[in-house]
């Protein structure tokens, strides 16, 4: 037989807290235990579940756990079944609710001297005890002409007067705990002698020169006084109007009319109602002058076909806030479709080429209307008008490569040379139409060129090979003036290139033949031993079959190269004495001497009184100072060559002679004494 060792028992429970209904069985066979609630099987949930044979509650729920629980044990083999005693929960709970008006039926019916009943909608088990509050202060039974039943949830005020006005709240407690009203009730019972607002003035916005009307009404017994004031507290009456409110009229019903409104009329207007008793009631309303600012400019927009784009129209600042709408081709855009307005935005869904054009954003209010156009371009992928073609360009001449395309907007064209972007410089120029001009074609310009034409919609590209057609030219051009050293061997080179290897020949400009000691060997003029007669004008002629011939004229000078007869020496001079740096050079043509001191050329015309360069080339510095110290370079030059030699100059303090030294003892260095 199945025996219950522990049976569930009825118990107190708290809403939302844990609980356990125990059940333990003993039986010879294998039994399984389940629970019934009001006769129906209990399904396990996270909140309520079987734990062994017992039923565990993670959080008791007053609604779902009310009823009779029973533990059932069943032997599935024999079919024997045993049921426990019934058990139930006494669930304690409390739940907040609002304070509501029970009597009269609506707030509008509350009049002085009528009975008012408020109900506290806090519920619980066991039944709570209630406490009422006005403006946060507890109310006790019989206090100030009210009847309070703490057992009841009702508060009755009989009769209700202005002194009962306030914010009513309630709290309640029971064995579970305490709760206060979730929503309170404001009771307002006016004193009829107090001014009460019937109609309050509203802020108004008017356009300049239009009229503005403020309505204001109070009620009281006896009827209240009504007065209008403008910003500076100046009263406005039909008899005494302030100077800036000449066009103001106060009507018998309290309304204030302002005609032909000006900017100075804008401001705060106060309507004051004063009853026989009570404080004045001040109502304010502002008169705004309508205004609308200019709209910001739109940048032109470029969109690609098929995309979705939005253009936001920033409404201009204005009072009242301007309304905004978009138009295209004079027609207001709808609020849905493929091209439509959404809020302040112009929306173009799946853009088509036909959507291109001018769209206008309009903004308007009482002050007027503003508009701003936006130009929308629908970009297309460029198409070819003329692709770059493989070209043969002549060296030294301008060359052109074309890249003509068309698209919307006008495509931008960039050129690449050997995959490197061509930046415009003195040699490369890209015209507006995309044509590349190479200003002075050089041999190494023979390579691949690629142009890319782009719009926001896409790009196209093409490449072309440039072959440079070499001109017949000297490489390098011979120097037009050259010097040869007398009685020495000399060579004058001349080389040229062309489409075909040129033949090179030297001749004397006077047409006379070259002497036997002068040979012309593959373009190099060779002088075995230069004589005076070798000086003169020579012509190098380069020629080939297809390109003809070119000439270069060279004037050869025979010279005796420069040598120094006298070179300046390392010199030390006492401060205040005179320094002499000697330099003499010889050569033919006769060389000129120049001096360089402290890294600057000494200009004989600007030397000043202390320095002088003699005819023979020597440099004299009088009254030397320490700053004259340094390296001095003698430069000898003629039309044929230039040579230089240098020496340091040291300026030292004159030592004080010691007793042991005789007057004739020499200084330890080469010294010029003057």
């Amino acid at each position: 037989a199945i025996v219950f060792i522990k049976q569930p028992s009825s118990q107190d429970a708290l809403q939302g807290r844990r609980a356990l209904l125990r059940c333990e069985v003993e039986a010879p066979g294998l039994v399984h235990v389940y629970w019934l609630l009001d006769g129906a099987p209990v399904q396990d949930t996270e909140r309520r579940f079987t734990q062994g044979s017992s039923l565990s509650f993670a959080a008791v729920d007053r609604l779902q756990d009310s009823g009779t629980f029973q533990c059932v044990a069943r032997d599935d083999v024999t079919g024997e079944e045993a049921r426990s005693a019934n058990a139930s929960f006494n669930i304690k709970w409390i739940e907040a609710g609002p304070v509501v008006l029970k009597h009269p039926a609506s707030e509008a019916e509350i009049q002085p001297q009528t009975q008012v009943t408020l109900r506290c909608h806090i519920d619980g088990h066991p039944r709570p005890t209630y406490q009422w509050f006005r403006d946060g202060t507890p109310l006790s039974d019989g206090q100030s002409n009210n009847t309070v039943s703490s057992k009841e949830r009702n508060l009755t005020l009989r009769p209700a007067g202005p002194e009962h006005s306030g914010l009513y709240s309630c709290c309640a407690h029971n064995a579970f705990g305490q709760a206060c009203s979730s929503q309170n009730f404001t009771l307002s019972i006016a004193d009829e002698s107090f001014a009460r607002v019937v109609l309050a003035p509203q802020d108004v916005i008017v356009a300049r020169n239009e009229e503005a009307m403020f309505h204001c009404q109070f009620s009281a017994q006896p009827p209240p006084n009504l007065q209008w004031l403008f910003e500076d507290e100046t009263p406005i009456t039909n008899r005494s109007r302030p100077p800036h409110l000449r066009r103001a009229t106060v009507f018998a019903n309290g309304s204030l009319l302002l005609t032909q409104v000006r900017p100075r009329n804008a401001g705060v207007y106060r309507c004051i109602g004063q009853g026989q008793r009570g404080p004045p009631v001040i109502l304010e309303a502002t008169l705004h002058l309508a205004e609308i600012e200019d709209m910001p400019l739109f940048e032109p927009r470029v969109f690609t076909a098929g995309s979705e784009e939005r253009v936001t129209c920033l409404p201009p600042k204005g009072l009242p806030e301007p309304s905004v709408w978009w138009e295209h081709a004079g027609v207001r855009l709808p609020t849905h479709g493929r091209v439509y307005q959404k809020g302040h935005e112009l929306v173009l869904a799946s853009i088509a080429e036909s959507d291109a054009g001018v769209y206008t954003c309009h903004a308007a209010n009482l002050a007027g209307q503003r508009r701003q156009d936006v130009n929308i371009t629908v970009a297309t992928v460029p198409t070819w008008l003329k692709k770059p073609q493989d070209s043969q360009l002549e060296e030294g001449k301008p060359g052109y490569l074309h890249c003509l395309t068309q698209a919307t907007p006008k495509p931008t064209v960039v050129w690449y040379r050997n995959q490197m972007l061509i930046s415009e410089d003195s040699r490369f120029e890209v015209f507006k139409n995309g044509t590349l001009r190479i200003n002075n074609v050089e041999v190494y310009d023979g390579t691949w060129y690629r142009c890319v034409s782009s719009t926001p919609a896409g790009s196209i590209e093409a490449q072309a090979r440039v072959q440079v057609l070499e001109k017949l030219k000297f490489t390098p051009p011979p120097q037009p003036q050259q010097c040869m050293e007398f009685d020495k061997e000399a060579t004058v080179p001349c080389s040229a290139t062309g489409r075909e290897k040129p033949t090179i020949k030297w001749e004397r400009a006077d047409g006379s033949s070259l002497p036997e000691w002068v040979t012309d060997n593959a373009g190099t003029l060779h002088f075995a031993r230069v004589t005076r007669d070798d000086a003169g004008n020579y012509t190098c002629i380069a020629s080939n079959g297809p390109q003809g011939q070119i000439r270069a004229h060279v004037q050869l000078t025979v010279a005796v190269f420069i040598t120094f007869k006298v070179e300046p020496e390392r010199t030390t001079v006492y401060q205040g004495h005179t320094a002499l740096l000697q330099c003499e050079a010889q050569g033919d043509p006769k060389p000129l001497i120049q001096w360089k001191g402290k890294d600057r050329i000494l200009d004989p015309t600007k030397l000043g009184p202390r320095m002088h360069i003699f005819q023979n080339g020597s440099l004299v510095i009088h009254d030397v100072a320490p700053e004259d110290s340094g390296r001095y370079t003698c430069i000898a030059g003629n039309s044929c060559n230039i040579k230089h030699t240098e020496a340091p100059l040291y300026v030292v303090d004159k030592p004080v002679p010691e007793e042991s030294e005789g007057p004739g003892s020499p200084p330890p260095y080469k010294m010029i004494q003057t």
Partner: antibody
Framework: QVQLVQSGAEVKKPGASVKVSCRAS????????IHWVRQAPGQGLEWMGW????????NYAQKFQGRVTMTRDTSITTAYMELSSLTSDDTAVYYC??????????????WGQGTLVTVSS | DIQMTQSPSSLSASVGDRVTITCRAS??????LNWYQQRPGKPPKLLIF???SLQSGVPSRFTGSGSGTDFTLSISSLQPEDFATYYC?????????FGQGTKVEIK
Amino acid sequence: QVQLVQSGAEVKKPGASVKVSCRASGYTFTDYFIHWVRQAPGQGLEWMGWISPNSGGTNYAQKFQGRVTMTRDTSITTAYMELSSLTSDDTAVYYCARYDYDGYSGWFDPWGQGTLVTVSS
Amino acid sequence: DIQMTQSPSSLSASVGDRVTITCRASQSIAIYLNWYQQRPGKPPKLLIFTASSLQSGVPSRFTGSGSGTDFTLSISSLQPEDFATYYCQQSYSTPPTFGQGTKVEIK
């Protein structure tokens, strides 16, 4: 004006040689190459070679190599073309032409009036 | 050597006609092509040099165009004195070579 004047017509026996002259005037003779071009009766133009009056350098067409000699005399601004071992196939009008140029390329202008050489036994 | 091929070899046309002669090179010769006119019993006369430059004294009805391997000589309105043989010649490389000629005859 620039002019090239050639020597008169010649009749030669097969195996003989012919020397045609071309006198230049109106420009600096040594500045331009002289080319020789021949035209057989009813045929097209055939290039024979050139001479540089300045250097005396020559360049002959492969076909005439060893049979043609081009010379010049700068003192009388005259160029010569001599063709040896004549055969009847050499019957043609022989033209000299100045080679004008611009450093990139060139063209024949002007041409001599032509010299008819007839080779007949 | 560069081969020059002219077409047609001959053509018949009337005074006032537009005539076009083409010349093709066996390899690219850039723009280095010249055109000559030869009347019977006369030496050739230069018409066009470097493909499109008109020699001074030549009427403007003669125009040349082309580059690379394909070139054309056009006579916009044929005149009686234009009936002759026309030759193209390349001066791109040595040896200079001529086309076989195009004879323009009176129709």
